[in-house]
Structure formats: structure tokens, C-alpha cells
């Protein structure tokens, strides 16, 4: 018994050869002995049944002077998966067709962190294995159902799944889109009364967009968080359902999704959460944005640099006189100078080696007050 | 545990309809293909139905095609059969059962491991 | 539809004795093949899959062998809890079919 596979909703070629590789009359027979197609010596394909019946299988005519005499099975169903029978010169030749699918679970677009279930479909009687492969490399192998958890932002892609069945292949492509913002997490660092951008680029583009969104904001200083801000996404359109009065944030009306803060200041140097739910789905998307303000200041005979905000414990805080080695360097928050020398200042926020972040004060002769530029 | 538990059997006249339901717990329902295999007083064992784990993918067997459909509610972990045009021959204990499957090395082998009880289904005048 | 043959309807056998139930397929089924069993008023129980592959938790003492169309489980040493009826099933072809039943028996 020969065996094929196809897949569901493409077309399937069942092979019958003659030995003489010449035209000659052939049947082509469902195993409950329905005749399906067939040539009974004048070169015209008979079909066995009304055309809305068998309009689906068909033949190779070209093939046929050269003893090749296939049925074309097209726009296959899984119903089609049986034992179908070519009879040519005396002998009845039993091809089996199995028809596959691959399917992922309920939608091809997932949220990060979720699961996404791959589901074969496959006739009573076979007994296939599945390999998945995704967009970067990774192999998953099992029975009818694979399942992959905790997506991660490169899933998004083309997987590819291999069905083997007795030394057979069939191939399937399926595209899935995990939607999530392109960074899951960012830090902003700005000088105090500087204005500050807050960007959400998303990883995925979709026709239409449609949502609800929200930050939430905890303040360094703040023993608790607070909502600055929600919206609605409707097409892409982005609209500002509320906002807080202190900070007053302004919201892009496009995407990608941005706010803006007028000044940096101390009291808003912390983390905030801008979560995305979107229309018809479960879950949301987060994205992480921190905020660290620097402020450079000189009181009296005191020169005091301090950052505010989520810093990592490895950063550098330093005070140097221009073109000069630091006076003051530590992995805290706050540095100071005592009896600072006339010159311009520079307060810097460093991680191994890279300034992140830089504020200048000018230190005057001690008969003037200091001048931040 | 893994347990399967039909219910929604009971006595109809000829022609009319029951719906069968099998209740799966102690397992991922929505991994697994799941059957209807059916049984006649003091006879044999005969196939009814087979259902992929998406549920777009069905069989019957000839005698209860376009009468009896099978289907499956992944969310609450159910299976059910709808039985229309009941006749006398219908009446059987039916029995829900998954398929199961083990693997060496890259061949995988499927089988009907698992079975509910069962629940009977009389159709008599 | 394949036909499943089973031989015989039934069979007495002494416990600690051995027995032989056999199954013919009307056509190839590979290695598709199973074997149940079932006490009265129970559903079935899988013992053998694959032909000759023994399910979970199944003692030892019950073995399946055959390809294609002639398969035969054998208890090589009857326990009390094995006398039942036992059923072989194909799984190759839809639908998928069963044999009629040996019923095992106490001699």
C-alpha cells in the first residue's frame, strides 16, 4: 500500500503506474468500490459521479501516454483521508491518503508571557509525530499537541512544523505575532527642570489597534504608587481619558505611544508601568519606564551633587573640576565637595566608564553666588 | 486523578434526542483527542465518534453519521454527543474515552487509554 | 470496515494455567492493535497496545504479539481477577473495529 500525505485545503497526487508506459484504461475507486474518475479507452476522463460530487479530483491527461494515470485530489478535506483504489491491467493498486493540519491555539496573535499551543490535526488510524521549529531556532517535538509557555518577544515569526508519518514528511508554516512593546523595560536620566520624553514603541504593527492603557507611577519619595494617567486606543488614535494635575503629562495622539513631562524634577524621579490592554484579548502588555533626576547645587562652601530615581548600585557618582580628575567618586547618591574651587563643576553619573547622565555648575570666586548654565 | 464521568443518558422514544455529556478532570482536556465508543446489551464494543483536541476534526462511523454530532467545550472540560433520530438500535451503554499516545525515539504510538463508565442510553417505544 | 475474528468465544482454563487468545484482522492493521478487558458492569481496561506493548500497570503475565492480520495475547499464569471477557480492537482504519469477545472462564 502506497502511502500520502497531504495537507488540508491544498491538493494531493495519488500515484498509479502502468508497467507498459502507455495510455491504457484505468478506475480510480473509493475501498467501498465508488468510482471516483476514470478512462475507458477513448482518452476522455469519466467521471463517477455528479460534477458538485467530484468536482474536487481530476487527473493528469498529460500523463497519461506516458503510463502515468495520478488522481488529483484538490482543496483537500480531512473526510478525504482513506484507502482509495487504481485499477489498471488486472490489478487493483491501494493508495492511502492522510490529510494533516496544523493549527495554533484559538489566535496566531499572543501576548508576551503567554502560551501558545500548536494543535495537529490528523485522521483516525495515523500515528504522527510533530516538530516545531520556531523563528529562532528552538525545537519542540511531541504527539498531536505541542505547547510552548511564556513567549518570548523573538517567537514572533514564521514557525515551521514537520509531520512524519511512516518515514513521510509534511511541511506547515505558521505565522505568529506576540505582541509586546519592543522594550520591556527603559531608563530615562535628565537633569532636574529638563523636559522628559517617555517612548512605548510597540514590536508589532497590526491593521487596526484597539485598547486601553494606563501608567502608574511610584515615586522614590511616594509610599505609594499613583495613576498619572489613561487613555484609549481606538484605530491608533490615541485619546487621554485622564490625567493627573501634578505632573501635568501630555500624550501623543499616534502611535507610538508617548508622553512628555515638562520638567524633571526630584519628587517624579521614580518607576512607572504602562500597562496596554488591548481589544479581544487576554492579558496586557507592561512596559517598565524609570526616571533618575540629577541635581548639582552650592550652598555656601558646599558643592552637593545627588541623583533620585531607580540606579543601579554599580553606578558612579562624581564631581570633577573640568579637565581635571574627579575631587569626589562613589557608588552612592550623593556626593559632596567642601570648599569647592573657582571653575566650572561637572557632576557626573557613570557606569563603567560611560556617562549617563551630566550636570554643570559654574563655582565663582567665594565673593560671587554660584551660576548653573 | 485522570477521570472521565458521562452523564445525560436515559430512556427516549424512537425518533427523539439526547445530549451526552463526559465531565474530564486531572488532565490538560484541551491536549487530547477524545472518542465515543458505544456498547449493546450483552454485545460488543463499536466506535461512535473520534474528535480532534481543537474539535475541527471529526469522525463517525456510518451508522450514526448525520444523525448523532460530537463536540467540545475545551473551556469548562467537556465532551458531549448529540443524539438525534434515536432509534432502537442506538441503545447501548456509551463510554467517553481519550487517546493517549507513548513515543520511542521519534515514532509515536496512540491508543484509547483512558474510559469514563459509562452511561446508558435506552430507546424503546 | 476491517472484520476482527476472535477464537475462541470461549475458554475454561485452571487458575495458574496458561491461555492463548487469538485475533484475525480481515486486513492488514500493522502493529494498530489492542487488546481490553472487561468484568461485568465495567468499562473496558487497555492491556496492550501497539500490538504487544503492555499499558500501565499491567502485570506482567499478560503479553501481546502479532503484525498484520494474526495476533494473540497470552496470560502465561491465570490469576482469579483475570477471568472476564477480553475484546481486541484495530485502530489502523476508521472506523476503528472490534472482535466479538472471548469470554475467559474458570474451569
Known amino acids: 500500500k502506497t502511502l500520502v500525505l497531504g495537507k488540508e485545503g491544498e491538493s494531493a497526487e495519488l500515484p498509479c503506474e502502468s508497467s507498459q508506459k502507455k495510455i491504457t484504461v484505468f478506475t480510480w475507486k473509493f475501498s467501498d468500490q465508488r468510482k471516483i474518475l476514470g478512462q475507458h479507452g477513448k482518452g476522455v476522463l469519466i467521471r463517477g459521479g455528479s460534477p458538485s460530487q467530484f468536482d474536487r479530483f481530476d487527473s493528469k491527461k498529460g500523463a497519461w501516454e506516458k503510463g502515468s494515470f495520478p488522481l488529483i485530489i484538490n482543496k483537500l478535506k480531512m473526510e478525504d483521508s482513506q484507502t482509495y483504489i487504481c485499477e489498471l491491467e488486472n490489478r487493483k493498486e491501494e493508495v492511502e491518503l492522510w490529510v494533516f493540519k496544523v493549527t495554533a491555539n484559538s489566535d496566531t496573535h499572543l501576548l508576551q508571557g503567554q502560551s501558545l499551543t500548536l494543535t495537529l490535526e490528523s485522521p483516525p488510524g495515523s500515528s504522527p509525530s510533530v516538530q516545531c521549529r520556531s523563528p529562532r531556532g528552538k525545537n519542540i517535538q511531541g504527539g498531536k499537541t505541542l505547547s510552548v509557555s511564556q513567549l518570548e518577544l523573538q517567537d514572533s515569526g514564521t514557525w515551521t512544523c514537520t509531520v512524519l508519518q511512516n518515514q513521510k514528511k509534511v511541511e506547515f508554516k505558521i505565522d505568529i505575532v506576540v505582541l509586546a512593546f519592543q522594550k520591556a523595560s527603559s531608563i530615562v536620566y535628565k537633569k532636574e527642570g529638563e523636559q522628559v520624553e517617555f517612548s512605548f514603541p510597540l514590536a508589532f504593527t497590526v491593521e487596526k489597534l484597539t485598547g486601553s492603557g494606563e501608567l502608574w507611577w511610584q515615586a522614590e519619595r511616594a509610599s505609594s504608587s499613583k495613576s498619572w494617567i489613561t487613555f484609549d486606543l481606538k484605530n491608533k488614535e490615541v485619546s487621554v481619558k485622564r490625567v493627573t494635575q501634578d505632573p501635568k503629562l501630555q500624550m501623543g495622539k499616534k502611535l507610538p505611544l508617548h508622553l512628555t513631562l515638562p520638567q524633571a524634577l526630584p519628587q517624579y524621579a521614580g518607576s512607572g508601568n504602562l500597562t496596554l490592554a488591548l481589544e479581544a484579548k487576554t492579558g496586557k502588555l507592561h512596559q517598565e519606564v524609570n526616571l533618575v533626576v540629577m541635581r548639582a547645587t552650592q550652598l555656601q562652601k558646599n558643592l552637593t551633587c545627588e541623583v533620585w530615581g531607580p540606579t543601579s548600585p554599580k553606578l558612579m557618582l562624581s564631581l570633577k573640576l573640568e579637565n581635571k580628575e574627579a575631587k569626589v567618586s562613589k557608588r552612592e547618591k550623593a556626593v559632596w565637595v567642601l570648599n569647592p574651587e573657582a571653575g566650572m563643576w561637572q557632576c557626573l553619573l557613570s557606569d563603567s566608564g560611560q556617562v549617563l547622565l551630566e550636570s554643570n555648575i559654574k563655582v565663582l570666586p567665594t565673593w560671587s553666588t554660584p551660576v548653573q548654565p | 486523578q485522570v477521570q472521565l464521568v458521562e452523564s445525560g443518558g436515559g430512556l427516549v422514544k424512537p425518533g427523539g434526542s439526547l445530549r451526552l455529556s463526559c465531565a474530564a478532570s486531572?488532565?490538560?482536556?484541551?491536549?487530547?483527542?477524545m472518542n465515543w465508543i458505544r456498547q449493546a446489551p450483552g454485545k460488543g464494543l463499536e466506535w461512535v465518534s473520534y474528535?480532534?483536541?481543537?474539535?475541527?476534526?471529526?469522525f463517525y462511523t456510518d451508522s450514526v453519521k448525520g444523525r448523532f454530532t460530537i463536540s467540545r467545550d475545551n473551556a469548562k472540560n467537556s465532551l458531549y454527543l448529540q443524539m438525534n433520530s434515536l432509534r432502537a438500535e442506538d441503545t447501548a451503554v456509551y463510554y467517553c474515552a481519550r487517546e493517549d499516545y507513548s513515543n520511542y525515539e521519534d515514532y509515536y504510538y496512540y491508543y484509547t487509554g483512558v474510559w469514563g463508565k459509562g452511561t446508558t442510553v435506552t430507546v424503546s417505544s | 470496515e476491517i472484520v476482527m475474528t476472535q477464537s475462541p468465544a470461549a475458554l475454561s482454563v485452571s487458575p495458574g494455567e496458561r491461555a492463548t487468545l487469538s485475533c484475525r484482522a480481515s486486513?492488514?492493521?500493522?502493529?494498530?492493535f489492542a487488546w481490553y478487558q472487561q468484568k461485568p458492569g465495567q468499562a473496558p481496561r487497555l492491556l496492550i497496545y501497539?500490538?504487544?506493548t503492555r499499558a500501565t500497570g499491567i502485570p506482567a503475565r499478560f503479553s501481546g504479539s502479532g503484525s498484520g492480520t494474526e495476533f494473540t495475547l497470552t496470560i502465561s499464569s491465570l490469576q482469579s481477577e483475570d477471568f472476564a471477557v477480553y475484546y481486541c480492537q484495530q485502530y489502523n482504519n476508521w472506523p476503528y473495529t472490534f472482535g466479538q469477545g472471548t469470554k475467559l472462564e474458570i474451569k
Open positions: 486486513q492488514s492493521v500493522s502493529s494498530k
Open positions: 474528535i480532534s483536541s481543537s474539535g475541527s476534526t471529526i
Open positions: 486531572g488532565f490538560t482536556f484541551s491536549d487530547y483527542y
Open positions: 501497539n500490538a504487544s
